[in-house]
């Protein structure tokens, strides 16, 4: 806490500009007005600020906004925005999807910090659902981001988001978030022709159960060994060599690099040692 | 020892047809893919497709789609590759090839001899 | 189709020299990727699978290195033998490409 001083004179701030840099923290605390460091907060990150004149500036504010800061300061936090803590933000109420972008811009090429697993958990909360334009911006700075929501969270994602979900944001999903999703993903795509619906659904059918994977392995897809084998072993295990042999097309042939490898190992102990040679591999049942 | 032995050199007329063989031995002709592949004059190698030797699945390259036929005879061991509509710049080594399963989709391990195709009028 | 951009197409260079030949893939090929020497009049011979692995009986003057895209064979000390056309071939998709060849003569 800094010492309540009276502004020396002469040094009472008429705005927010570079003469600060030069201010002690005791000057900073006692000749720079909250009010005004509110209305001018875009112009702190111009200013080279050390990190203890900005834990002054951030004090001030607290002063100020002991219930929370207002949107209008928290949209032009900038590198301020560092120094809160997850405490802090969950006084804010963010509902503008730009100042999400503002404050996700400072933290970008970082991992996900809990400052900022805070603040995107408050705005996601504030407005009901993960919605398409939300996750499009959380999955462009964060593409793990989706597969870091547990099934309970996931399932507030509507159908239409998932429009906004590319194929590396599901890299590190595990089965239990894929068995939410594939639904959502199947509902969103379902008016999609074959060949166009099996490039959007390619990344979700981890969560794909047996009789999808069935109707999938009638329309010659060619799936490829890596979606393969990130298919749930459940799922695979009741299909016959006919409909593997035609769900994968070409790719069939890389059964043979995977034969000790599950889903493939558990589904060819499955099968009739005749079906399994018919694939020319020497599969061993 | 693996050997991918192949059908002589061939001379055709343009419009023709040509059909290579293939005859495998010294593994289980069965448990391999047979791949065929081409080299045309001073030109580099070009995959032209596979066939599943147990029940005769062929998977072609777009380009010989139209033209090529993949076969084999389980009772000789042996892969056929036949290139319809012949043209002048079908001029060519063909080889059969022999993929090896450690990795992937396999690279080929073993090769025949080649089989020179001469398309001229 | 995975398309293989194998450069440079020719080359020469002295006896004991370090030749280096490139292949770049249109997409994501991880390390499935083979090396093969082809002598005039015969069937390729392979060198290298899986970026690096060398074949037995391939003497160690040939290695290769890369993943990703981006891939890079080499001879550490160029022998009389070596002269020859060296083509790479990718073989993560089950439809096989080869890159264009390189021709590696003795100046």
């Known amino acids: 806490e800094v010492e309540k001083t009276a502004c020396p004179s002469g040094k009472k701030a008429r705005e927010i500009d570079e003469s600060l840099i030069f201010y002690k923290k005791w000057e900073l605390e006692a000749c720079v007005d909250a009010a005004l460091l509110a209305t001018q907060m875009d112009r702190v990150n111009a200013i080279p600020f050390t990190y203890e004149q900005l834990d002054v500036l951030k004090h001030k504010l607290d002063e100020l906004y002991p219930q929370g800061y207002p949107e209008s300061v928290i949209q032009h936090l900038g590198y301020l925005f560092l120094k809160m803590s997850p405490e802090d933000i969950r006084k804010w109420n963010v509902t503008s999807l730009e100042t999400l972008k503002a404050l996700l811009e400072v933290n970008k090429g970082h991992e996900m910090s809990p400052q900022v697993a805070t603040l995107i958990d408050r705005f996601v909360k504030g407005r009901g659902q993960l919605d398409k334009d939300t996750l499009d911006t959380l999955t462009a700075f964060y593409p793990g981001y989706l597969c870091s929501l547990s099934p309970e969270e996931l399932s507030s994602v509507p159908p239409s988001s998932i429009w906004a979900v590319r194929p590396q944001d599901l890299d590190t999903c595990d089965p239990r978030q894929l068995d939410v999703l594939y639904p959502k993903a199947r509902l969103a795509f379902q008016n999609m022709n074959g060949s166009e619906y099996f490039v959007k659904i390619q990344s979700f059918l981890g969560g794909a159960p047996t009789e999808d994977l069935k109707a999938l392995s009638q329309q010659n897809v060619s799936m490829d060994l890596a979606t393969f084998m990130k298919l749930r072993t459940d799922a695979v295990l009741p299909l016959t060599v006919a409909e593997v042999q035609k769900l994968l097309g070409p790719h069939v042939e890389g059964l043979k690099a995977e034969e000790r490898h599950r889903p493939v190992r558990d589904w060819i102990l499955r099968q009739r040692q005749d079906d399994l040679d018919t694939l020319g591999l020497g599969l061993q049942g | 020892e693996v050997q991918l032995v192949q059908s002589g050199a061939e001379v055709k007329k343009p419009g023709a047809s040509v059909k290579v063989s293939c005859k495998a031995s010294g593994y289980t002709f069965t448990n391999y893919w047979m791949h065929w592949v081409r080299q045309a004059p001073g030109q580099g190698l070009e995959w032209m497709g596979n066939?599943?030797?147990?029940?005769?699945?062929?998977y072609y390259n777009e380009r010989f789609r139209s033209r090529v036929t993949m076969t084999v005879d389980k009772s000789t061991s042996t892969a056929y590759m036949e290139l319809s509509s012949l043209r002048s710049e079908d001029t060519a080594v063909y080889y059969c090839a022999r993929p090896y399963y450690g990795s992937s989709y396999g690279y080929f391990d073993y090769w025949g001899q080649g089989t020179t195709v001469t398309v001229s009028s | 189709d995975i398309q293989m951009t194998q450069s440079p197409s020719s080359l020469s260079a002295s006896v004991g020299d370090r030749v280096t030949i490139t292949c770049k893939a249109s997409?994501?090929?991880?390390?499935?990727i083979a090396w093969y020497q082809q002598k005039p009049g015969k069937a390729p011979k392979l060198l290298i699978h899986y970026t690096s692995e060398l074949q037995p009986g391939v003497p160690s003057r040939f290695s290769g290195s890369g993943s990703g895209t981006d891939f890079t064979f080499t001879i550490s000390s160029l022998q009389p033998e070596d002269i020859a056309t060296y083509y790479c071939l990718q073989y993560a998709n089950p439809l096989r490409t080869f890159g264009g060849g390189t021709k590696v003569e003795i100046k």
């Open positions: 997409q994501d090929i991880n390390k499935y």
């Open positions: 066939i599943n030797p147990s029940q005769g699945g062929p």
